[in-house]
């Protein structure tokens, strides 16, 4: 099938979230990359949309990202927007309910997002060639 | 490819007002902020005012609060300056900016040139 | 506001030079500052954000380091195409503020 405007639109997102970073984007999350070999795309997607969740769920309202004037709040308020907006287009190319998070392994949301980016990259290659 | 392009510059007597465009392509216009930045002639730049364009907040430099307005048209994608009581001192290139998604401001338009003159 | 001040005002180098850059902040900013580059008749460009992070495509002979209040600009070895003016900029708080510029001539 050819690359779904979903895709697209994730694609563009990590484009713009991997533009600059911010002191929150150096905070870790679960590295689900670390060990995906036995992990179907699908999987892989909601497990990187549960990951994100877990992110913005805990640190949405958490003070060393809002920061202390309303110039870095801003910031904040729009990491969390654009992570809100990448969870729920992954979850929609996913089409699971849910999906365990268990690996030990960490990165930086900086570093999730970077490779996120190159997976989803390469899938939008082979549905557009 | 993110484009910005001013419009709306001239000459306009003391006392008197412009409103100045600047029309974005190229990316989605609310995921980012909007700002306008001048430079007077032979002269460093000074920041105005900032909006955020999914909400419409603006915020502004002390100096411009009152005489300057800042706007956006979603639907269009174009930012707006209104700029009244003009004086001999607001003559500069008017540039509209877009601000990084975190940080600065990472897109700039050519710039609209702006004389207040009698 | 918080006010930028730049030194040197000009810098009078050689293509291959080291260049540095200073700004001094009248308060902490923490690491929210900026440098852009301007060339006549031309808008300015982000170089660096949030004190020393290279904005996309821009070459790694630039880099920024600093915290607080005080700021540098280090290009390592000046291109022909460096010559230029270099601000910094504050986006801590609003206003937003600019340095007055540091001009990079050729010697």
């Known amino acids: 099938h050819k690359c779904d405007i979903t895709l697209q639109e994730i694609i563009k997102t990590l484009n713009s979230l991997t533009e600059q970073k911010t002191l929150c984007t150096e905070l870790t999350v679960t590295d689900i990359f670390a060990a995906s070999k036995n992990t179907t795309e699908k999987e892989t997607f909601c497990r990187a949309a549960t990951v994100l969740r877990q992110f913005y769920s805990h640190h949405e309202k958490d003070t060393r990202c809002l920061g202390a004037t309303a110039q870095q709040f801003h910031r904040h308020k729009q990491l969390i927007r654009f992570l809100k907006r990448l969870d729920r287009n992954l979850w929609g190319l996913a089409g699971l309910n849910s999906c365990p998070v268990k690996e030990a392994n960490q990165s930086t949301l900086e570093n999730f997002l970077e490779r996120l980016k190159t997976i989803m990259r390469e899938k939008y290659s082979k549905c557009s060639s | 490819e993110v484009q910005l392009v001013e419009s709306g510059g001239g000459l306009v007597q003391p006392g008197g007002s412009l409103r100045l465009s600047c029309a974005a392509s190229g990316y989605t216009f609310t995921d980012y902020s909007m700002h306008w930045v001048r430079q007077a002639p032979g002269k460093g730049l000074e920041w105005v005012v900032w909006i955020n364009t999914e909400t419409g907040e603006p915020t502004y430099a002390d100096d411009f609060k009152g005489r300057f307005t800042i706007s956006r048209d979603n639907s269009k994608n174009t930012l707006y300056l209104q700029m009244n009581s003009l004086r001999a001192e607001d003559t500069a290139v008017y540039y509209c900016?877009?601000?990084?998604?975190?940080?600065?401001?990472?897109?700039w338009g050519q710039g609209t040139l702006v004389t207040v003159s009698s | 506001e918080i006010v930028l001040t730049q030194s040197p005002a000009t810098l009078s180098l050689s293509p291959g030079e080291r260049a540095t850059l200073s700004c001094k902040a009248s308060?902490?900013?923490?690491?929210?500052a900026a440098w852009y580059q301007q060339k006549p008749g031309q808008a300015p460009r982000l170089l660096i954000y949030?004190?020393?992070h290279r904005y996309t495509g821009i070459p790694a002979r630039f880099s920024g380091s600093g915290s607080g209040t005080d700021f540098t600009l280090t290009i390592s070895s000046l291109e022909p195409e460096d010559f230029a003016v270099y601000y910094c900029?504050?986006?801590?708080?609003?206003?937003?503020?600019f340095g007055q510029g540091t001009k990079v001539e050729i010697k």
């Open positions: 900029q504050q986006d801590y708080t609003s206003p937003w503020t």
């Open positions: 308060q902490s900013v923490i690491n929210d």
């Open positions: 900016a877009r601000g990084g998604i975190f940080y600065g401001m990472d897109y």
């Open positions: 949030y004190t020393s």
